[in-house]
Each structure stands twice: as structure tokens, then as C-alpha cells.
Interface confidence: low
């Protein structure tokens, strides 16, 4: 039925060919010496690419970005749901393809993959009930969220569900497990001696990725998981519920996938693109699928389940939320209700479904084989007012601005690729499949990846997570941009950001965080080792303790939410567009790549200190098993010295020599790649970065020296300490080798 041909990069390759053929013919005809030709080619292209001063280029690009356009695009993208795998999201892909072409990109292609997705059964809805001793359902959770005003007749609103939950109807006693973090289960099992085996657990959303919660519950022997949003985490004091404010109403529910993919992409085709000829695993061998039913609910329904809880009292105040319930842990209901049980009714199905990425290309004039990528997803759970369309609207405006410059005769030095990813919400599938399909090109040509999901999660200050290589780029760029914040009129973004989110280590500098996962940069950074970064406007973490933003992944995440409550003037969106776009511009257009390897040296020392201090909590074992970090500290010292010398050479070398320039830029580009271990981390083959990985306990968080960290985690409980400390030593040696090897890539080549 769907006979779309698979589009490839051949059109791009063909488009490049004539110029090179002509150039080659000239060389042969004229009998030029090869080096002379290369000099001529690069100097010619360079002057073509910079027909106005670099500063003016950047200024022209930034000045072209308009808040009003972002607002218009956001409105356009949020009128109907765009769930991955649906006709509506395919239509939006085609619209974006058409508009990017109009904006002036050289080519815009749709790339499709057939991946495993998950949907509720329309005729057999999911719900949870309390049943009495006769098996009668005396309470049922709601089947859908009450739609917001004005959206009552909108079709295709998928009801709240946990994507990839297996089907099942478990029943049993309830156990409240707080956030279902590793430490919460330690508290339950080790301190309180509560056994979750055979029980249905209820956990509050927040703190960690929901997939980790489900994994922890499975390991504890639970037969089902109920996830709910507690007002303590999703209702900020003093703010009204939607539609009168930005807080979560009692009937609001957070959707989301509950996979533990560890970077695999499509669960049926790990490591390879899910194309027409792909070999697909059976569902039993699929990567990362949960084995027990899972379902999300709002706090009205949670109240009904939690108010009857008996058993043990909660261990301390950190286990109590804001509902008027005792927050007893259980198992089971109290006194009069002890014969009542909880039953889950889950009928969702997983099926192979077609998804579409949109890939736009703006060919580089000087180094077309070097790629700077700006990517963000297009699929949403419902309207996607914030996630993802506040990001997609910004990408759209960035493409429009770049296109305007191109129409005026400008081209970037390097190629810029723009991506609208599909099925991010189902496990980062669109980006991962595309990267798997293009991995050989990306690992040879990928300069940087800038992520562009939600532009806002608050309106307080900037938030940046990136590779240390980009720290200086971000600092320098934000010093050039105007702050949108009240009270900082005429001041730089750097200034307001530093004031509101100061670095915990360096005074007078803003905080930049480690990259974790949970978004589309994952495959580029964690698997392929391409320098990556992300930026968005965020909340005040000091005063707003709630997790994410209250209406995350609910039906209430609408255009009106953004326009009324978060960013009426779209000034924060514009600032994020300037940061993301400015980073892309610099990465694609700077003669010398704007990476500073010395910043990596600084963090490597910090991370080595941190992991050493963790290990030193076990001084006796370190002595017994001869565990030493000397080699790692030595490698870090070598890295620091070599990076310092490289920076001196970078400052002083002849920038007009194209061979030297390319050599130095390649050393910078390949530095991130040098931190990749082809064997990957233990049991996580697609997390291959030795310095950073998503935390094994929270996919959203980044962990430094993750191999060593995981080997040390809970080591005192390991049954075979000798083997456990042997693994610590092995991980130290891998980290040492990797840091040393990376350092040597920066050494003078001859």
C-alpha cells in the first residue's frame, strides 16, 4: 500500500559531482601540481563563502530571526496531534519538507523506517480498578483526560498510556515505592524488609526517567506498575491549574515510553537501520521492552488508590507528597479495606509502523564533507505545545534565516544538515535509525550535533548541557547576545545566566551541565562520539522543585499554554533560537573550529577526583585488592599538557595554509571521537563514550567515568568482592587508556 521509494543521499552526491569533475578536468588540462590546485580551490572557495565579513554574516543571520515567526510556526504545528506513526505526523513531515525547500535549502528528503511502536487498543481501553472480595470493580480510573476548552472535538487524542507496556491484567496488593529509584527500593527491601514480589507497585513520577522506575520494579519482582503525578512534583504553589495557569489539573496525566533501550534504537533492529531488508528480532528478543504491565494516572485517581493504603508508614518526609493521604507503604489496604485488591487492565499493542524523518541540506562552500547538524523531533504525544513544537518552531525559523542568507548569495563554510526527527517519544527512534543508516559518513564527517527539542521548560534563565569542547563557544556567544530577562535590559545573556545559574566551581561563570540522554543527541554523542550540545530556557530550580514542567506530556500542553503563561512575547523562544542558531552558525562557518580542548582537560581532572573520592570510601578494599588511580591521574596530566601545547599551536599556525588548517580542524573534530570505546560499556554496547554515559539509574542524567562508577556502585553488597574490585581495576585501565589515547590525537602529527 505504501510504495514510497527509499530516498538516499545520491542526489546530494550527484549535485556535488559536476563541480569536482570540472575542477579535476582543469587540473589535468592545465597540468597543475596537486597542492597548487588544492591551495587554489580552498582560497577560491573561501573567498566565495565569505563575501561579507564573518561578523556581518553572524549578525545578518541573528537579525533575521523573528519572535513573531516562531509564534506563527508554533501555532501551525500545534493545532492537531502529531503522534508518531500516524497520518497526521506524516502530513506534517511533508509540510516541513515543502517549507524547508521554499526557505532555500539545497535539498530536503524524507527518510522512512519501519520501527516498533506502541498504541492503546481503541476498542478495549486501559484502566486500573479497585476490586472487592467478589471481584467486582468498585472504582475505576478515568479512560481519558478531560480535553481543554476549544479542543473538545479534536480527534486523535491518544489516551494516557505507558508506551510498550505489555498486555496483562495483574491483580494484587499495592505497595507505594516513592519515586521507584534504586535508593527507594534499597530502603524498602533492605531497611524496611518489604517484599514487592507479586505486588503491584505505585510510584510517583519525577526525579528519574520512568523507564528506570519500571526496570527497578521488575527487578524487585512486582507484577505491575502504576505511575502517577503527585502535586508535590507537578503542582507549583501559588499557580492555578490549566487553563487558568500552568499547573497540572487532577485529571491530567503524563504519557511516555517505559523502555530501557540503552541507546539501541528500534527494539527489533539494534545496531542497524530498520529498513526494507532489515532482519527483525522476534518480540521476545526485542531490546528493552518491559515485562510487566504499566499504566499512568493523574492525582485525582491516585488519591483514590493511596487513601486506603495500610501496612508500614512511610520512612520519612522525603516519601510523602502533597495529597491528603497517609503515604503508607503497604503492602495492601488498611483495616476495613484489607480484602480489596487493585487490578490493572492493559490491552495496548506493539506493532511495526512506518516513521518519517525530514533531512534538509545546506551544502558547505569550502568543506562540504564536514557536517554540522541541527536536529529536533516533530512527533508529539498530543498537541506538543512545548514538547517538541516549541523546539520545532525554533528550528523552522533558523532554517528560514539560513535560507534567506543563502538566497542572498551566502553559503556556510561547512555543510549544515537540518533534521526533523520522528518517534523520539517512542525511544529516540527516528534519530537513531538515521544515524545507524549513516554511521560511516557521520563518524568520518560529523563535526557537531546541536539538539533542538523543547525550547522552554520555564522562563527563568538559560540551561545548557554540552561537551566541554563547546564551553568556550557557548560563553563567547552568550556574551554577544542580549538577555531577554526582566531586570537585565541592555545586559548580555551571559550576565543574566551567570547571575541566575552560577557555576558551582568557577565564580563569574554560568553552570553548564553534562549531557545525559532522553533526547535525540544520544546516538550522536554517546554512540558515535560527535561533539554535541543542547540549550533551552528553564525554570528556577531553587524555588520550583517540581520535576520537568507540570503539564509535560499531557493533553494540556497546548499553544495557549505557551502563549498565555510561558512566553507571551516569544522573547525566550527567540533567545533560544539565537543560541542554537548561533552555535550552528559558528560551528559551520568558523575557519578554525570553535572547540577548546583545554576545557576537556579541566573536567577530566574534576571527574578523576570525583571517582577517586568515591572509591576512597573503601580504603581497606583498595589496599587489599591493590586498586590505584595513579595511572588515570597520569593520563589526565598528559592530556592537560598535550592540550595546552595543541592550543598554542592552534593559536600560532598559518591559517591561510589549507592543508594545515584541515589538519588542525580534524584533530579538533576527532577529539570527541577518541573517547569512544568500540566495545562499549558493560552490558550497554551502544553507550560507547568512556567519559560520559547516561546514568544506569536515571537515563536523563549524565554520569562521568561511567564504567568505573558502575563498577563501584553498591560494591559493598557484591557477593564476590574480589571479582567486583577486579572489574573496578579493569574499568580504571580502560579509562586510563582512553584518556591517554585521546591525548595523543592532539600531539603534533610529525
Amino acid at each position: 500500500m505504501w510504495n514510497l521509494l527509499h530516498e538516499t543521499d545520491s542526489a546530494v552526491a550527484t549535485a556535488r559531482r559536476p563541480r569536482w569533475l570540472c575542477a579535476g578536468a582543469l587540473v589535468l588540462a592545465g597540468g597543475f601540481f596537486l597542492l597548487g590546485f588544492l591551495f587554489g580551490w580552498f582560497i577560491k572557495s573561501s573567498s566565495e563563502a565569505t563575501n561579507i565579513t564573518p561578523k556581518h554574516n553572524m549578525k545578518a543571520f541573528l537579525d533575521e530571526l523573528k519572535a513573531e515567526n516562531i509564534k506563527k510556526f508554533l501555532h501551525n504545528f500545534t493545532q492537531i496531534p502529531h503522534l508518531a506513526g500516524t497520518e497526521q505526523n506524516f502530513q506534517l513531515a511533508k509540510q516541513i519538507q515543502s517549507q524547508w525547500k521554499e526557505f532555500g535549502l539545497d535539498s530536503v528528503e524524507l527518510t522512512h523506517y519501519d520501527v516498533l511502536l506502541s498504541y492503546p487498543n481503541k476498542t478495549h481501553p486501559n484502566y486500573i480498578s479497585i476490586i472487592n472480595e467478589d471481584g467486582n470493580e468498585i472504582f475505576n480510573t478515568s479512560l481519558f483526560e478531560p480535553p481543554p476548552a476549544g479542543y473538545e472535538n479534536v480527534s486523535d487524542i491518544v489516551p494516557p498510556f505507558s508506551a510498550f507496556s505489555p498486555q496483562g491484567m495483574p491483580e494484587g496488593d499495592l505497595v507505594y515505592v516513592n519515586y521507584a529509584r534504586t535508593e527507594d527500593f534499597f530502603k524498602l527491601e533492605r531497611d524496611m524488609k518489604i517484599n514487592c514480589s507479586g505486588k503491584i507497585v505505585i510510584a510517583r513520577y519525577g526525579k528519574v526517567f520512568r523507564g528506570n522506575k519500571v526496570k527497578n520494579a521488575q527487578l524487585a519482582g512486582a507484577t505491575g506498575v502504576i505511575l502517577y503525578s503527585d502535586p508535590a512534583d507537578y503542582f507549583a504553589p501559588g499557580v492555578k491549574s490549566y487553563p487558568d495557569g500552568w499547573n497540572l489539573p487532577g485529571g491530567g496525566v503524563q504519557r511516555g515510553n517505559i523502555l530501557n533501550l540503552n541507546g539501541a534504537g528500534d527494539p527489533l533492529t539494534p545496531g542497524y537501520p530498520a529498513n526494507e531488508y532489515a532482519y527483525r528480532r522476534g518480540i521476545a528478543e526485542a531490546v528493552g521492552l518491559p515485562s510487566i504491565p504499566v499504566h499512568p494516572i493523574g492525582y485525582y485517581d491516585a488519591q483514590k488508590l493511596l487513601e486506603k493504603m495500610g501496612g508500614s508508614a512511610s520512612p520519612d518526609s522525603s516519601w510523602r507528597g502533597s495529597l491528603k493521604v497517609p503515604y503508607n507503604v503497604g503492602p495492601g489496604f488498611t483495616g476495613n479495606f484489607s480484602t480489596q485488591k487493585v487490578k490493572m487492565h492493559i490491552h495496548s499493542t506493539s506493532e511495526v509502523t512506518r516513521i518519517y524523518n525530514v533531512i534538509g541540506t545546506l551544502r558547505g562552500a569550502v568543506e562540504p564533507d564536514r557536517y554540522v547538524i541541527l536536529g529536533g523531533h516533530r512527533d508529539s504525544w498530543v498537541f506538543g505545545g512545548i514538547d517538541p513544537q516549541s523546539g520545532a518552531a525554533v528550528v523552522h525559523e533558523i532554517v528560514r534565516s539560513f535560507g534567506t542568507l543563502k538566497k542572498e548569495g551566502w553559503r556556510p563554510r561547512r555543510t549544515i544538515l537540518f533534521a526533523s526527527w520522528d518517534a523520539e517519544e517512542f525511544g529516540l527512534l527516528g534519530s537513531t535509525e538515521w544515524a545507524e543508516e549513516n554511521s560511516r559518513l557521520l563518524q568520518e564527517r560529523g563535526v557537531a550535533y546541536i539538539n533542538a527539542d523543547s525550547s522552554i521548560e520555564g522562563n527563568y534563565t538559560l540551561r545548557v548541557d554540552c561537551t566541554p569542547l563547546m564551553y568556550s563557544l557557548v560563553y563567547n556567544l552568550t556574551k554577544e547576545l542580549e538577555s531577554p530577562d526582566e531586570g537585565f535590559e541592555g545586559k548580555s545573556l551571559y550576565e543574566s545566566w551567570t547571575k541566575k545559574s552560577p557555576s558551582p566551581e568557577f565564580s563569574g561563570m554560568p553552570r553548564i551541565s553534562k549531557l545525559g540522554s532522553g533526547n535525540d543527541f544520544e546516538v550522536f554523542f554517546q554512540r558515535l562520539g560527535i561533539a554535541s550540545g543542547r540549550a533551552r530556557y528553564t525554570k528556577n530550580w531553587e524555588t520550583n522543585k517540581f520535576s520537568s514542567y507540570p503539564l509535560y506530556h499531557s493533553v494540556y500542553e497546548t499553544y495557549e499554554l505557551v502563549e498565555k503563561f510561558y512566553d507571551p512575547m516569544f522573547k525566550y523562544h527567540l533567545t533560544v533560537a539565537q543560541v542554537r542558531g548561533g552555535m550552528v552558525f559558528e560551528l559551520a562557518n568558523s575557519v578554525v573550529l570553535p572547540f577548546d580542548c583545554r576545557d576537556y582537560a579541566v573536567v577530566l581532572r574534576k571527574y578523576a577526583d570525583k571517582i577517586y573520592n568515591i572509591s576512597m570510601k573503601h580504603p581497606q578494599e583498595m589496599k587489599t585488592y591493590s586498586v590505584s588511580f595513579d595511572s588515570l591521574f597520569s593520563a589526565v596530566k598528559n592530556f592537560t599538557e598535550i592540550a595546552s601545547k595543541f592550543s598554542e599551536r592552534l593559536r600560532d599556525f598559518d591559517k591561510s595554509n589549507p592543508i594545515l588548517l584541515r589538519m588542525m580542524n580534524d584533530q579538533l573534530m576527532f577529539l570527541e571521537r577518541a573517547f569512544i570505546d568500540p566495545l562499549g560499556l558493560p552490558d550497554r554496547p551502544f553507550y560507547r563514550h568512556v567519559i560520559y554515559a547516561p546514568s544506569s539509574h536515571n537515563k536523563y542524567a549524565g554520569e562521568s567515568f561511567p564504567g568505573i562508577y558502575d563498577a563501584l556502585f553498591d560494591i559493598e553488597s557484591k557477593v564476590d568482592p574480589s571479582q567486583a574490585w577486579g572489574e573496578v581495576k579493569r574499568q580504571i585501565s580502560i579509562a586510563t587508556f582512553t584518556v591517554q589515547a585521546a591525548a595523543e590525537t592532539l600531539s603534533e602529527v610529525a
Epitope: 491518544v158 506493532e351 511495526v352 509502523t353
Partner: nanobody, 127 residues
Framework: EVQLVESGGGVVQPGRSLRLSCAAS????????VHWVRQAPGKGLEWVAY????????YYADNVKGRFTISRDNSKNTLYLQMNSLRAEDTAVYYC????????????????????WGQGTMVTVSS
């Protein structure tokens, strides 16, 4: 009440034409893709054609391609199937069916989980 009501069926000679209609009510017709499905006497269900919510995409089963045309008028909440060059093997009860709420399962054409069906209209092609 949410419903689909087919009409336009009847007895027709081979080679002739027929136009089926399907009137929708009780839901936001313009937001959904819709299918025509048929069931020949003593046979199983057979998918015939699909039209997207805004009519920008249309797909047909191989054995009706070039002969049948699916269309819709969202202002009238009505779906149509224009059937030309009819053959004896087109004899069946024709049903219109709303696509499931989260959209067409792209890449598949066989096992749709339709959530709303019409009662069907009989088409008999006979000389």
C-alpha cells in the same frame, strides 16, 4: 450518536458504474482518515481504499486501482467511492470505516482495528 451510514448500492451490469456514499455523524469527520472495506458473499473482509483526513493521500487495493476513486467532502461530512468498470468479482457488501484514533498504521494495509463501521450497502454486479 457516533455513526456511519452507507448508501448507493444496488444491482448493476458489468462494465457499468456506481457511486457509494457514506454519511458521518457524531464525531469530527474532518479529523479522521476513512476506509472502504468490502465483504464478498461467503468471503472474509477485504480492504478497498483509504483517504486521509484532508484528502491529500489516497490508497487503493491493487485489484481496484484505476477503476475506483475515493473522495470526501468534509463540509458535508460525507465519504464517496466512485466505482467504474465494475466486474462480477466486485460483488460484495461495502462498508465505510473510520480509521483508529491514532491514525493509519503506515506501511500496512491488512489488519485495521476500525473503531466505527457502517451497516454496509450491497453492490451486485451481474448481467
Amino acid at each position: 450518536e457516533v455513526q456511519l451510514v452507507e448508501s448507493g448500492g444496488g444491482v448493476v451490469q458489468p462494465g457499468r458504474s456506481l457511486r457509494l456514499s457514506c454519511a458521518a455523524s457524531g464525531f469530527s469527520f474532518s479529523g479522521y482518515g476513512v476506509h472502504w472495506v468490502r465483504q464478498a458473499p461467503g468471503k472474509g473482509l477485504e480492504w478497498v481504499a483509504y483517504i486521509s483526513y484532508d484528502a491529500s493521500n489516497k490508497y487503493y487495493a491493487d485489484n481496484v486501482k484505476g477503476r475506483f476513486t475515493i473522495s470526501r467532502d468534509n463540509s458535508k461530512n460525507t465519504l464517496y467511492l466512485q466505482m467504474n468498470s465494475l466486474r462480477a468479482e466486485d460483488t460484495a457488501v461495502y462498508y465505510c470505516a473510520k480509521d483508529p484514533a491514532w491514525g493509519l498504521r503506515l506501511g500496512e494495509s491488512s489488519s485495521y482495528d476500525f473503531d466505527i463501521w457502517g451497516q454496509g450497502t450491497m453492490v451486485t454486479v451481474s448481467s
